[in-house]
């Protein structure tokens, strides 16, 4: 039960006090007791429950009431059973007793009121009225946890607007309200109660820019809302009528958790005594609700795909046809960004990452817009954000970004368990340098801070600065699997490729050509690739870089070797010793459920079939996966990217609720 106020009683004159239902009120009977009195007894109206803690009672009086010694060891507390119909309608009488004097009486007139701030603290999607209880003031994780949840109202329900809903202080319509969390103030008081008392709703100054609260005002024609708390307004006096009354508020978050904001927002209603005009208002009671802002959550390749995004650029019609066919097979919606909108920027994966936010009453996809800001920079905000599709961005919007700030360098693992630590929503993966140096690249600190602050997908830093482009999607991917952990980690593997080519040479296929069918490309014989010592040295270096990540991933994701599949791939070191794929990078694939869109490697044709394609199929088809090899050579590969780099996917949110985990 919540703590109420302290009431001091005195025999000199009656005391008037307010007692809020659900609170425990302390009664000070000692400090004003007559000097020659040594004990006291208590009589109450039926609506008041008094509890006296002292062991043992002094003596039982014949009337049935007990007396207790007046000493500091006595604790008197009272609670009320029901709200008062009129002011002071409940009475407590304290009788002080002494050896030589008749009893002296002190009177306390109590007004019982019900004042409670309620929200969906049980996370059921419904607001249940709660009396003032301690639990509302804390937010706890886990299946038995409690505490309300707020969504950042980061979608754009008004198609005419260019701004997010949370950027204005208006409620568009009932759709906009659904993005907010309901909070209800319940009051039950005597009719004249608010002539002498006032309620004020408030938020800490440090949190006022993170939240906006609308009060629903029931008009004759429609429900209208007005802002009562927000970035410019940390408190608001409420006009509450006497009697029984419910007041609804709609709460929206304005900011995601981040470095200086753990995501918790406390809204408090304070009851003030304003009866003495010549004195300042005094706080009689407070009730609070704590909300946590829902984190932005990424979805791994193992989640079912719902929508595929791709760019239309000069001469990529065949690529588009292949992606369209794959999306149809996977029963996905397809969104094509036309040339006039992408400004010759085909790297859809790099521009954005689509995740979601979730409260018990609502789930919303949210696009995280990278700060890379090239030709596609308007696409997330103009074409992706919209009604029930949110938007967030971080990092410098002008300059100061590196290649590692593109979201080909941002992936997430499927759910994993590492030792006895569970990651039911997986872990975020991004690439970094091995150590900071004058020219090393890393993901911008603002992006790293944002990702860490979401708490539910603890990030893992991988090493990717060894690559020309520097993205993790150049050496790893995840695919769904029917067994073990429900997925496999795919890693690009020069070792596996050399092994395959050596086997082919041993079988007499040393003259088979890589890049057959590619115009204006020097075709390479298997035997020449195997005998090129420089290329071998380069791939030995690449293998070491990938192996470093392999061990890191095994440790941080709790993987065994049998959870990993090596995809044959060669790299070459280019300027400044940065690596890029020697032939189309097969691990850079589009995963749509069981349907995989894999860059066509143009490997050596042996017995009428590309030996690289054959090898990859033999590794992935036993998992029930269907491999489609997409020709991206001229339009993507020679421009330092592949199928995954050129596409993006919105996936189904996890069925697991983020608040049920313990970060």
């Amino acid at each position: 039960m919540a703590q109420g106020t302290l009431i001091r009683v005195t025999p000199e004159q009656p005391t008037h006090a307010v007692c809020v239902l659900g609170t425990l009120t302390q009664l000070d009977v000692c400090s004003s007791a007559p000097e020659d009195c040594t004990s006291f007894s208590v009589n109450t109206s039926p609506g008041v429950v008094v509890d006296i803690a002292h062991s043992p009672p002094a003596k039982k009086k014949s009337t049935g009431s007990s007396t207790w010694p007046l000493d500091p060891g006595v604790e008197v507390t009272l609670t009320m059973k029901a709200a008062s119909g009129s002011t002071g309608d409940q009475k407590v009488q304290i009788s002080y007793h002494g050896p030589k004097t008749p009893p002296v009486k002190a009177l306390l007139y109590l007004t019982g009121v019900e004042i409670s701030l309620s929200a969906d603290i049980t996370r059921t999607g419904k607001v249940k009225p709660t009396r003032a209880v301690e639990d509302k003031r804390t937010w706890t994780w886990g299946p038995c946890g409690q505490g309300a949840i707020l969504l950042v109202n980061c979608d754009r329900d008004n198609p005419e607007s260019s701004a997010m809903d949370c950027e204005d202080d208006e409620v568009l319509d009932s759709k906009d309200l659904k993005d907010m969390s309901l909070m209800t103030l319940s009051t039950k008081t005597p009719q004249d109660f608010f002539t002498r008392h006032t309620l004020v709703l408030h938020v800490a100054r440090s949190e006022m820019d993170k939240v906006r609260v609308f009060q629903a005002t029931r008009g004759r024609l429609s429900s209208r809302c007005r802002v009562v708390l927000g970035p410019k307004q940390p408190s608001h006096y409420l006009m509450v009528p006497g009697g029984k009354h419910n007041m609804d508020f709609y709460v929206e978050a304005l900011a995601f958790p981040d470095t200086n904001f753990p995501g918790l927002i406390t809204l408090t209603v304070s009851m003030l005594d304003t009866s003495k005009l010549e004195l300042p208002e005094a706080v009689v009671f407070q009730d609070s609700v704590v909300f946590r802002v829902a984190p932005w959550i990424m979805t791994p390749n193992t989640q079912p795909p719902q929508e595929v995004y791709v760019c239309s650029i000069f001469e990529n019609e065949d690529f588009l046809k292949s992606v369209t066919a794959l999306a149809m097979q996977a029963r996905c919606k397809l969104t094509i960004c036309p040339e006039e909108e992408n400004m010759d920027d085909q790297w859809m994966q790099d521009e954005m990452e689509i995740g979601y936010i979730q409260a018990p009453h609502k789930t919303l996809p949210v696009v995280f817009d990278s700060p890379r800001n090239r030709g596609l920079k308007e696409f997330p905000i103009k074409r992706v954000m919209g009604p029930d599709f949110g938007y967030v961005t971080r990092g410098p919007q002008t300059g100061g970004v590196s290649g590692l700030d593109s979201f080909g360098n941002l992936e997430v693992s499927p759910p994993v368990t590492v030792g006895d630590k569970e990651y039911p929503l997986g872990r975020i993966l991004f690439g970094d340098s091995c150590y900071p140096s004058s020219d090393s690249r890393e993901m911008h600190q603002a992006l790293q801070d944002f990702l860490s602050a979401q708490q539910v997908q603890a990030p893992v830093k991988l090493y990717s600065d060894w690559l020309t482009v520097g993205h993790v999607d150049e050496f790893l991917s995840f695919v769904p699997a029917p067994d073990r952990k429900g997925f496999r980690l795919l890693l690009a593997s020069p070792r596996s490729c050399y092994k395959l080519f050596q086997e082919q040479q041993n079988e007499g296929h040393g003259d088979a050509l890589l890049f057959q069918g590619i115009k204006k490309k020097n075709q390479q014989k298997i035997k020449n690739i195997l005998s090129n010592t420089t290329l071998r040295e380069h791939n030995s270096f690449v293998e070491r870089c990938i192996d470093w990540n392999r061990e890191l991933l095994k440790r941080e994701l709790g993987l065994a070797e049998s959870d990993i599949i090596d995809i044959p791939q060669l790299f070459k070191l280019k300027e400044f010793s940065k690596a890029e794929a020697f032939f189309p990078n097969m691990v850079n694939m589009l995963v749509l459920g069981k349907h995989l869109g894999i860059p066509k490697p143009f490997g050596p044709i042996i017995n009428g079939r590309c030996c690289l394609e054959e090898k990859v199929c033999s590794l992935l088809e036993p998992l029930g996966l269907h491999c489609t090899f997409i020709n991206d050579f001229y339009t993507y590969h020679i421009r330092h990217g592949e199928v995954h780099c050129g596409t993006n996917v919105r996936r189904k949110p996890f069925s697991f609720k983020w608040w049920n985990m313990v970060p």
Partner: antibody, heavy 128, light 111 residues
Framework: QVQLVESGGGLVKPGGSLRLSCAAS????????VSWIRQAPGKGLEWVSF????????YYADSVRGRFTISRDNAKNTVYLQMNSLRAEDTAVYYC?????????????????????WGRGTLVTVSS | QSALTQPRSVSGSPGQSVTISCTGT?????????VSWYQQHPGKAPKLIIY???ERPSGVPDRFSGSKSGNTASLTISGLQAEDEADYYC???????????FGGGTKLTVL
């Protein structure tokens, strides 16, 4: 063959800023590595900065790191050198140069380290 | 003070050969085969004449040749001609924090 033209030079006070542009014609600049090299009056060549064709990494000379930023806009076929906190010793003719990033090379050809095509240069004078 | 050391000047008569040296360290010339040479006439932009130690871009006469031994690279111009009079700069990739270094330049005078 690509042709390069630098612009944006001029007189600037110490502590000031300038943005140099290197516009390409005759070919798509996105296929080229681009470097900036400068030459103080009567002095030798000094390598300043580099950006790769994929626009994914940059390098700088110790003398300019933290003050200069190289960037490219492939749609505009232009590379930029943003120069902040300029000093008297930055006075020089600034040349833009490029080398083709040939995807056909089987191993590193070193094209990022030599300058195949040069512009005519633009003079930057830093003086109070 | 340039990172790569070149003689300030060399001279030769028409038809003769001259060699310009470029001395670096084990971290640049000695480590990489990414040495290039540039010719610069007064008031003009430099022109690439040798790359990757000894390779010549198309259009550069075969009188120009490059070589390397240890930490020193050399440019040899045989059959000197009057139009060869210019400043010559060597350059190398380096593993230092400035990844491309130039020499201080050598003034070639054709007597």
């Amino acid at each position: 063959q690509v042709q390069l033209v630098e612009s944006g030079g001029g007189l600037v006070k110490p502590g000031g800023s300038l943005r140099l542009s290197c516009a390409a014609s005759g070919s798509t600049l996105s296929d080229y590595f681009v470097s900036w090299i400068r030459q103080a009056p009567g002095k030798g060549l000094e390598w300043v900065s580099f950006i790769n064709s994929a626009n994914t990494f940059t390098y700088y000379a110790d003398s300019v790191r933290g003050r200069f930023t190289i960037s490219r806009d492939n749609a505009k076929n232009t590379v930029y050198l943003q120069m902040n906190s300029l000093r008297a010793e930055d006075t020089a003719v600034y040349y833009c140069s490029s080398a083709n990033d040939d995807v056909d090379d089987i191993v590193a050809p070193g094209r990022g380290y030599y300058m195949d095509v040069w512009g005519r240069g633009t003079l930057v004078t830093v003086s109070s | 003070q340039s990172a790569l050391t070149q003689p300030r000047s060399v001279s030769g008569s028409p038809g003769q050969s001259v060699t310009i040296s470029c001395t670096g360290t084990r971290g640049d010339v000695g480590r990489y085969n990414h040495v290039s040479w540039y010719q610069q006439h007064p008031g003009k932009a430099p022109k690439l004449i040798i790359y990757n130690v000894y390779e010549r871009p198309s259009g550069v006469p075969d009188r120009f040749s490059g070589s390397k031994s240890g930490n020193t690279a050399s440019l040899t111009i045989s059959g000197l001609q009057a139009e060869d009079e210019a400043d010559y700069y060597c350059s190398s990739h380096s593993r230092s924090s400035t990844p491309v270094l130039f020499g201080g330049g050598t003034k070639l005078t054709v007597l």
